[in-house]
């Protein structure tokens, strides 16, 4: 059988607002007082098994004791009333769980959405945490009819159980209730049709046009509640490799439609499209984006001719020369399609033309010593580019006019080249460049620059601490001008090794030192100067600095009959490197001198 408790705590289910005061009372039963020989002054209050300080306890009468808590902050406290039976044995009388929290805030930001094909979902901001069990109920009604309540599981949203009825306004609000209070949100009044989020458009397809290489035609299927809604669209696109989307102006897609032509695109370029929709009034929510679909614009003829240049091979005969016509593959943005071949037309000054069709990017021809005009066009399946024209003068003609003030300098990890144009109008410039090495030939790469350019950088990721030889040639209508060259480094470093010094001549009081220039492969930069350090085994070290143009130096004021140790270092702008140490001994007597 259940034992009757010796007393009770009131209130039995205490819930307290945080920060407020709270008083509980424990009332002992008469029978209990007699059985244990106690009264209310024997009561010990405990919170979470710890005794409450005496100053918080008041004995009201022989059966009743109260306890008061100020500024309650703990979320949950086990409060027990205990007696000291027979004055010493502590016995539990009754216990309650005291909860603390806040009354619900008025819910705000109530919004509802009708996901197409689903029931209406409403969401709100419940405000601050209550720390108590709080029930949120979504209420909705027409002017004449209430709908079933929606009990929220999470306290921030609820999906109603009924299908929405369109074109009739409903009123929606949220009620929040817990042990400390009850509150309602402001109500919102709307037609569910203005809260629809359509399903994304589907079956998006992209087709190109043979007539126009700058357009792609899109078509798709929209749902719009099975045709109940008129939808407007939002179309975005990007090139296949781009990460940012380009927006079709929304004013162009305002009217309900299931197709659209996107214009001003680049030829022979793959584009990716996506589309979403919303009620044409703009009310409601944008659908999620459709699945992406891609298409490629039709080819157009190449928009410009390739860069075009030539090299004359060393010739053995006198009447003919071997000429290598060379050109660059057009970048995709200018090729506008797949380049099928190149058409080269060679015209001798006084005779008929010869046409060559070439699939590669160079053509070697044997030419007489006459002047020739070469033209080059790139061809794709739509047509040919404009022609690049190059005059190949007779080898007997001396090139006049070159660029002046040619300079090269590194900046932002690029090697820049600049020059002053010649005084005669230029068609274009050709830059040729290669890494100088004593172990390999200077095989040039080249690039073409427009006539308006007088500053550019070498294209491609250049090597550091390698010496580049750069040649700039202006090209005129009559043929190439004179070439100007210089050497430059993208980034210098200290030399890989220092000079190896030797003696050329040793006298009693002087020695002529000689050394070879460091090979260009080991220079790692411009050699600015040398230092020569020399010392005897006991004397202090002497250092002299020598200009980089020298390959010998005379040490003077040396002691006779003395062993000298010599070492040379070479310096670039980025530091120096010592060569090996060398020793020599001065003679005791000068030539012809006797003791």
């Amino acid at each position: 059988q259940l034992l009757e408790p010796c007393g009770y705590i009131y209130p039995e289910f205490p819930v307290v607002q945080r920060g407020s005061n709270f008083t509980a009372i424990c009332v002992l039963k008469e029978a209990c007082l007699q059985h244990y020989y106690v009264n209310a002054s024997y009561i010990v209050w405990k919170t979470n098994h710890a005794a409450v300080p005496r100053e918080q306890v008041t004995v009201i009468n022989r059966t009743t004791s109260s306890v008061t808590f100020t500024d309650v902050v703990l979320p949950s406290v086990q409060l027990t009333c205990n007696i000291l039976s027979f004055g010493q044995i502590e016995q539990n009388v009754y216990g309650v769980t005291m909860l603390s929290g806040f009354p619900p805030d008025k819910p705000t930001n109530l919004t509802c959405i009708v996901n197409e094909g689903k029931n209406m979902l409403c969401q709100w901001d419940p405000g601050r945490e209550t720390y108590l069990e709080t029930n949120y109920t979504l209420k909705s009604e027409w002017a004449t009819e209430k709908f079933p309540d929606c009990q929220s599981k999470h306290g921030t949203s609820c999906m109603v159980s009924y299908m929405p009825t369109y074109y009739v306004n409903i009123e929606v609000w949220v009620e929040a209730e817990n042990a400390l209070g009850k509150v309602s949100s402001e109500s919102i009044n709307f037609d569910p049709v203005d809260k629809v989020k359509p399903t994304p458009p589907y079956n998006l397809s992209v087709t190109n046009s043979e007539e126009l290489s700058s357009i792609l035609k899109l078509s798709w299927v929209s749902s719009g509640l099975g045709g109940l809604l008129d939808l407007k669209s939002d179309i975005q696109y990007r090139t296949k490799d781009a990460s940012t989307w380009i927006q079709v102006p929304l004013e162009d897609t305002m009217s309900p439609r299931t197709s659209f032509t996107v214009q001003d695109l680049k030829p022979f370029t793959e584009y990716v499209f996506r589309i979403r929709s919303i009620k044409d009034s703009g009310k409601g929510y944008w659908s999620d984006w459709s699945e992406e679909a891609s298409g490629t614009t039709y080819e157009d003829r190449p928009s410009r001719p390739p860069s075009f240049w030539y090299k004359t091979n060393p010739s053995h005969g006198q009447e003919y020369r071997s000429v290598r016509l060379i050109w660059k593959a057009l970048p995709l943005s200018e090729a506008n399609g797949k380049i099928l071949d190149y058409e080269v037309i060679l015209t001798q000054s006084k005779s008929v033309s010869q046409t060559y069709t070439v699939t590669g990017t160079e053509l070697t021809v044997n030419l007489t010593n006459d002047r020739y005009v070469a033209s080059l066009a790139a061809r794709n399946k739509v047509g040919k580019s404009a022609a690049a024209v190059l005059t190949i003068p007779s080898p007997h003609v001396t090139a006049a006019y070159s660029v002046v003030n040619l300079k090269a300098f590194p900046k932002d990890n690029l090697l820049w080249v600049e020059w002053t144009p010649p005084p005669k109008p230029v068609s274009k410039y050709i830059l040729e460049w290669c890494v100088l090495s004593e172990n390999a030939p200077c095989v040039e790469d080249w690039q073409q620059e427009d006539a308006t350019v007088n500053r550019t950088h070498l294209r491609g990721r250049l090597l550091e601490s390698k010496c580049y030889q750069i040649t700039v040639t202006p090209v005129f209508a009559t043929g190439p001008g004179g070439s100007e060259s210089l050497k430059a480094y993208l980034k210098q470093a200290a030399p890989a090794r220092g000079p190896t010094v030797r003696t050329k001549k040793v006298g009693k009081n002087e020695a002529v030192l000689a050394w070879d220039q460091i090979p260009v492969d080991d220079q790692n930069g411009f050699i600015r100067n040398y230092s020569i350090s020399y010392r005897t085994s006991v004397g202090k070290e002497m250092v002299v600095h020598v200009d980089s143009s020298h390959t010998e130096y005379t040490l003077s004021s040396l002691s006779s009959d003395t062993l000298y140790m010599v070492r040379m270092a070479a310096y670039t702008d980025e530091g120096g490197k010592d060569g090996p140490e060398f020793t020599f001994t001065t003679p005791k007597f000068a030539q012809g001198e006797i003791e």
Epitope: V443, E444, D445, R461, L462
Partner: nanobody, 114 residues
Framework: QVQLQESGGGLVQPGGSLRLSCAVS????????MKWVRQAPGKGLEWVSS????????YYADSVKGRFTISRDNTKNTLYLQMNSLKTEDTAVYYC???????RGQGTQVTVSS
Amino acid sequence: QVQLQESGGGLVQPGGSLRLSCAVSGFTFSNYAMKWVRQAPGKGLEWVSSISGGGGATYYADSVKGRFTISRDNTKNTLYLQMNSLKTEDTAVYYCAAQNLDYRGQGTQVTVSS
């Protein structure tokens, strides 16, 4: 990003042949001169052969002239080195690289041994 991947190396007897390939991606292959270099065990890098961007001009080290042939297929973005009459001193790791740029492959081992 730029990638150069050599293949075709292996073990061959003196007098034998091998054809090395280098597949290139990430830059406009036909616009740049290319080269083969090699590194024998315990030695520095040695230039072997070069070819112009269009393939019309080729260059060889004296040690391989008449035995090796460099070529390129710009439609396939691939560089080749045909190696005939191989000698033991051709044993090395062979690398393909852009002639004047900081692009180089990981290398392929060629071992000539009886």
